[in-house]
């Protein structure tokens, strides 16, 4: 009887089943009642990254310098190539097919998280007693001075976006 | 039992033709592919024809292709090769074979065929 | 045309010895090979299909190993009726091929 469902790593082809061929390898040909299914090496620059009977391998991505893009893991005939972006620039998607510049944390932010090649920089309003007086990505909100450890007194009150102003004691008091 | 049963050699001389047929018993001979391969006085093997089970698909190396024809009646139990344009070359015990498991799994006792003058 | 070169081409042996027959193809065929045996005035019979899978009714002396290009029909300990042409086949590809064959025999 002619089979109906196939093993793993076949598949079903006039009323037979063949080999599927490995990652790296394209069909050639289908498998017969004589001969296993025939299958070549991807070409350089080319993969297939699961068992298959694709009659064509797929391109390796480019990387193009012209989006930002660099390579992070050139491809082989069973991987891609994985690109990245440029120092400074993020990629647009997961799939990294674009770079933007990294976002800077304006003055009265601070930098949550620093950016990557994949990921844009996280920027957090600076809290109480916390500020951020430059537009920066890599830059946290710093902790306000504390004019007391320096046995001064605050002679201006800090803000997101300013330190505290310590001056002297005042001697006459 | 499985049996294959190989008739028609003989001696032709070169450009003649002649029919070459294997009795098939012992398993359901439409379920399998079947091939012919000979066997030259050195005891080299050479793959001749081969035909699928339904008797569609059909396969020659290039030094036979367009003077063998390779034929099955399933109704009959039977497989055929029909050799044309015969040279000194063709000379050879003819062995018909079932296809099982992609791998010759049984041989006939084999047909003479000798083309001289 | 894969080529399919065995050696050696004779093999004179002691019965109860081991022997090893190679058979190496002229492009990767990944484990598809069989290995036949023919006895004097016989047929060829099927041994080994697959490079290594033994084949029901074989006596379990004959084993085959290999993939790619290099292949190897073992038998251990070697007996009077193993004498013979053996024959590698590959199925890899059209035109099916078989090797010029290795003839072993008594020592």
């Known amino acids: 009887e002619p089979p109906t469902a196939c093993r793993e790593k076949q598949y079903l082809i006039n009323s037979q089943c063949c080999s599927l061929c490995q990652p790296g390898q394209k069909l050639v040909s289908d498998c017969t009642e004589f001969t296993e299914t025939e299958c070549l090496p991807c070409g350089e620059s080319e993969f297939l990254d699961t068992w298959n009977r694709e009659t064509h391998c797929h391109q390796h991505k480019y990387c193009d310098p012209n989006l930002g893009l660099r390579v992070q893991q050139k491809g082989t005939s069973e991987t891609d190539t994985i690109c990245t972006c440029e120092e400074g620039w993020h990629c647009t998607s997961e799939a990294c097919e674009s770079c933007v510049l990294h976002r800077s944390c304006s003055p009265g932010f601070g930098v949550k998280q620093i950016a990557t090649g994949v990921s844009d920089t996280i920027c957090e309003p600076c809290p109480v007693g916390f500020f951020s007086n430059v537009s920066s990505a890599f830059e946290k909100c710093h902790p306000w001075t504390s004019c007391e450890t320096k046995d001064l007194v605050v002679q201006q009150a800090g803000t997101n976006k300013t330190d505290v102003v310590c001056g002297p004691q005042d001697r006459l008091r | 039992e499985v049996k294959l049963v190989e008739s028609g050699g003989g001696l032709v001389k070169p450009g003649a033709s002649l029919k070459l047929s294997c009795a098939a018993s012992?398993?359901?001979?439409?379920?399998?592919?079947m091939s012919w391969v000979r066997q030259n006085s050195d005891k080299r093997l050479e793959w001749v024809a081969s035909i699928s089970s339904g008797g569609d698909d059909t396969y020659y190396p290039d030094n036979v292709k367009g003077r063998c024809t390779i034929s099955r009646e399933n109704a009959k139990n039977t497989l055929y090769l029909e050799m044309s344009s015969l040279k000194t070359e063709d000379t050879a015990l003819y062995y018909c074979?079932?296809?099982?498991?992609?791998?010759?799994?049984?041989w006939g006792q084999g047909t003479s065929v000798t083309v001289s003058t | 045309d894969i080529v399919l070169t065995q050696s050696p081409a004779t093999l004179s042996v002691i019965p109860g010895n081991s022997v090893s027959l190679s058979c190496r193809a002229s492009?990767?065929?990944?484990?598809?090979l069989h290995w036949y045996q023919q006895k004097s005035h016989e047929s060829p019979r099927l041994l080994i299909n697959?490079?290594?899978q033994s084949i029901s009714g074989i006596p379990s002396r004959f084993s085959g190993s290999g993939s790619g290009t290099d292949f190897t029909l073992t038998i251990n300990s070697v007996e009077t009726e193993d004498f013979g042409i053996y024959f590698c086949q590959q199925f890899n590809s059209w035109p099916l091929t078989f090797g010029g064959g290795t003839k072993l025999e008594l020592k």
């Open positions: 074979t079932r296809a099982g498991g992609k791998a010759m799994d049984y």
């Open positions: 012992g398993f359901t001979f439409s379920n399998y592919g």
């Open positions: 697959y490079a290594s």
């Open positions: 492009q990767s065929i990944r484990d598809n």
